[in-house]
Every structure is written in C-alpha cells, then in structure tokens.
C-alpha cells in the first residue's frame, strides 16, 4: 500500500491523461483525486500504465467505493477488471448485458478465471434465470459455459434459451446435465416439423428417454452413429432391432465397428440372436435361440 | 500477440542509442505505446509516450530534450531514440501497448537492457 504524502505543488491531475504514466506510484495516490478517475474510468483503457500504476488506482476506487463500484464505473473498467479480485465482484450489482460484454471481452481469448466465473455467477443470479440474450453472450465468449453449470443451475434456463445453444456448447456436457436440458429442448423446439426438429434436437438426444427414440425411430431421420453412441445406456436398451434399423437409417452398418462399446454392446446383449442376424452385419454377443427372457424388473412392478 | 523490444546495448555516457519495439500478431494502430524503465531495486517509471495516431507525444522530465519517440504503422513498430546518454538513463526499457480497436487490450514486452557506463 501507498503512504500517504502531500502532492507535489503543480502535478495534481485536472484529467486522466497520458501524462500519469510518469508519476510515481506515491504521486498517483497523492495527486489523482478518487471520484475524477470513476468519471474518466473509460480513459484509463487508453492509457498505457503499468501493472503497479493500476494497483494504485484500484486502490483509489477501492476507497471511494468500500461496499462496491457502480455499475456507472465497472462498465468503463477495461483491463483493471482483470486487478479485480472475486471478493471484489461479489459486491458489485451488475444488471446490464453490455456490462457483462465490455469486462469479458476483456478477458476474451483466455480461459475462464475465477472473476470472469464470478462476475458470470453474479450476473445470473441478479437477473434470476439464464435468458436467451445472456446465454447467447456467454456462449459467443465460452462456449463450454453450459456445460460448467450443474443440473439445479441448468435448471432455471427458460426452454427459449435454448434456441441460443449451438452443437459446441454441449460436447463437454454429462448425461446428469443433458437429462434437464433435454425437455427443455423439446419444448422449444416442438413446433418444428420433423427434419429440422431433428436436426436442433439432435446435440440434446443423450437426454431422451426410450419412449421419445422409439417416436424418432418412426421418422426416418438416418441418426449417425456419433449420436447413437452418446444417447443413454438405459434409454437404448429396451429399443427393438426393428427400431434401431429404422432410427440409424443407413448409418446402422456403423453398429458392427461400435459393438464393444456401450451402449452398443449392452443393446446387443438384450437382443435375441435371430434378431440381430437380420441386420446381416454379424454382431454377435445376442440370447441365443429358444431362450426364455424374464424381466425381472416388470415382475417386480407387478408384485 | 507481443511486444518484442530491441536496440538495447552498452554506451558511453553522451552516447545514442535507438530502441524498436515491434508488434507481433497485431497491429499496433489502433494501441498508444509508452516507453518505460526500471533501474536495478527501483521503480519501474514511465519515459515516454505516444498516442496511436502519432500525433500527441510525452516525455517524462528526465528525459526531455534528449529521447525522441516515434511510430512507424507500416512497419508495425515503434521507435525510441536516445542521445546524450546518462549513467542514471541506465535500466532495463520495455514497451507497453494500451487501447487497441475495442479499447480494452494491453501487451507488454520483455524489455531490453541498456547500460550507460564509461
């Protein structure tokens, strides 16, 4: 920290200039007062100083605003956003969307940092649920954001947020996270005839419960094998060769290089034999002829 | 994307020197550069300064009269020219750029070494 000392007769600052990056750290503490640098905070960007200088500014700030900046102030902070600490934007009340743009383009071409997730966090919660125009910022910025969130926050995404979601945003995502995105999907997309509402249900499908492949499975919609392989285990199983034949289209010949990996080779194995043979694509592994199947789990429902 | 520094040497004192500083990965346009030093167990402080168009330029007291700052866009570099060379001029001169088209990058280079000694 800067001790405090007089500032020296004539150098006291009129505007925030070029002119600063040629005072020592102690003159800046003495001679810039706190409120002119918040209403010239946008100058600062233009200005080359150095990473010590702009301590001494935060620091400037810091004391005129102890409970946290306006938001007049954060959406001029350019390159000091990245002297911000969490615990610094945990005070901060930032509602306006060109606010959030302004400090992440800031950060734009690094890894999301802890203050960028703060900020972020902050953000959402001020506006009480992830809306089209923020998702579609966030996205643009970090396209595996949606994916960093978990289920209970994937939660509060209204269903027309999701016309924001590219097929990116969604490669780092688990089936927990898919399972609540999933209906969400659905239901913004329900009023779109067949092929285009596959074609923006698709990157969703590792979310989709049997009934809803078996409804697929009926409209022709030739899923390619990268699709299949991340739907759920548990929803490919009860699915019929009949089913999968007409849901893979012509892509159904890429079952025989898949069937050692799930969910491919747990299908297999629920299939009987003659079933599979009439793929003519030699998977082996299905109930052998004259088998007798008991599903122990509808027995249970049922006693 | 950086800055990379150049020119930097031993002189004599009332010697010249000229220091580059080029831009890599980006243009340098649309950033004002400043020219700063840092002697050994000081402060880094400002030296010079220039505005993206060229047009406005600054120098700290020390070095007024003496060092002259110039820009070449085509070139994608900036220039600072030493002469009358000081003993207490001697430190390590690193460039910084600010500003930028969406007016919120900085690069910062290495810096090279100068010394003035007899």
């Known amino acids: 920290e800067v001790e405090k000392t007089a500032c020296p007769s004539g150098k006291k600052a009129r505007e925030i200039d070029e002119s600063l990056i040629f005072y020592k750290k102690w003159e800046l503490e003495a001679c810039v007062d706190a409120a002119l640098l918040a209403t010239q905070m946008d100058r600062v960007n233009a200005i080359p100083f150095t990473y010590e200088q702009l301590d001494v500014l935060k620091h400037k700030l810091d004391e005129l605003y102890p409970q946290g900046y306006p938001e007049s102030v954060i959406q001029h902070l350019g390159y000091l956003f990245l002297k911000m600490s969490p615990e610094d934007i945990r005070k901060w009340n930032v509602t306006s969307l060109e606010t959030l743009k302004a400090l992440l383009e800031v950060n734009k071409g690094h890894e999301m940092s802890p203050q960028v997730a703060t900020l972020i966090d902050r953000f959402v919660k001020g506006r009480g649920q992830l809306d089209k125009d923020t998702l579609d910022t966030l996205t643009a910025f970090y396209p595996g954001y949606l994916c960093s969130l978990s289920p209970e926050e994937l939660s509060s995404v209204p269903p027309s947020s999701i016309w924001a979601v590219r097929p990116q945003d969604l490669d780092t995502c688990d089936p927990r996270q898919l399972d609540v995105l999933y209906p969400k999907a659905r239901l913004a997309f329900q009023n779109m005839n067949g092929s285009e509402y596959f074609v923006k249900i698709q990157s969703f499908l590792g979310g989709a419960p049997t009934e809803d492949l078996k409804a697929l499975s009926q409209q022709n919609v030739s899923m390619d094998l990268a699709t299949f392989m991340k739907l759920r285990t548990d929803a490919v199983l009860p699915l019929t060769v009949a089913e999968v034949q007409k849901l893979l289209g012509p892509h159904v010949e890429g079952l025989k290089a898949e069937e050692r990996h799930r969910p491919v080779r747990d299908w297999i194995l629920r299939q009987r034999q003659d079933d599979l043979d009439t793929l003519g694509l030699g998977l082996q592994g299905g109930i052998p002829n004259g088998y007798l199947v008991l599903d122990l789990s509808m027995q249970e429902a049922l006693s | 994307l950086q800055l990379v520094e150049s020119g930097g040497g031993l002189v004599q004192p009332g010697g010249s020197l000229r220091l580059s500083c080029a831009a890599s990965?980006?243009?340098?346009?649309?950033?004002?550069i400043g020219w700063f030093r840092q002697a050994p167990g000081k402060e880094r402080e400002g030296v010079s300064y220039?505005?993206?168009?060229?047009?406005?330029?600054n120098y700290a007291d020390s070095v007024k009269g003496r060092f002259t700052i110039s820009r070449d866009n085509a070139k994608n570099t900036v220039y600072l020219q030493m002469n009358s060379l000081k003993p207490e001029d001697t430190g390590v001169y690193s460039c910084?750029?600010?500003?930028?088209?969406?007016?919120?990058?900085?690069?910062w280079g290495q810096g090279t070494s100068v010394a003035v000694s007899s």
């Open positions: 910084a750029a600010a500003g930028g088209y969406g007016n919120s990058s900085r690069y």
């Open positions: 220039i505005s993206s168009s060229g047009g406005s330029t």
């Open positions: 990965g980006f243009t340098l346009d649309y950033y004002a």
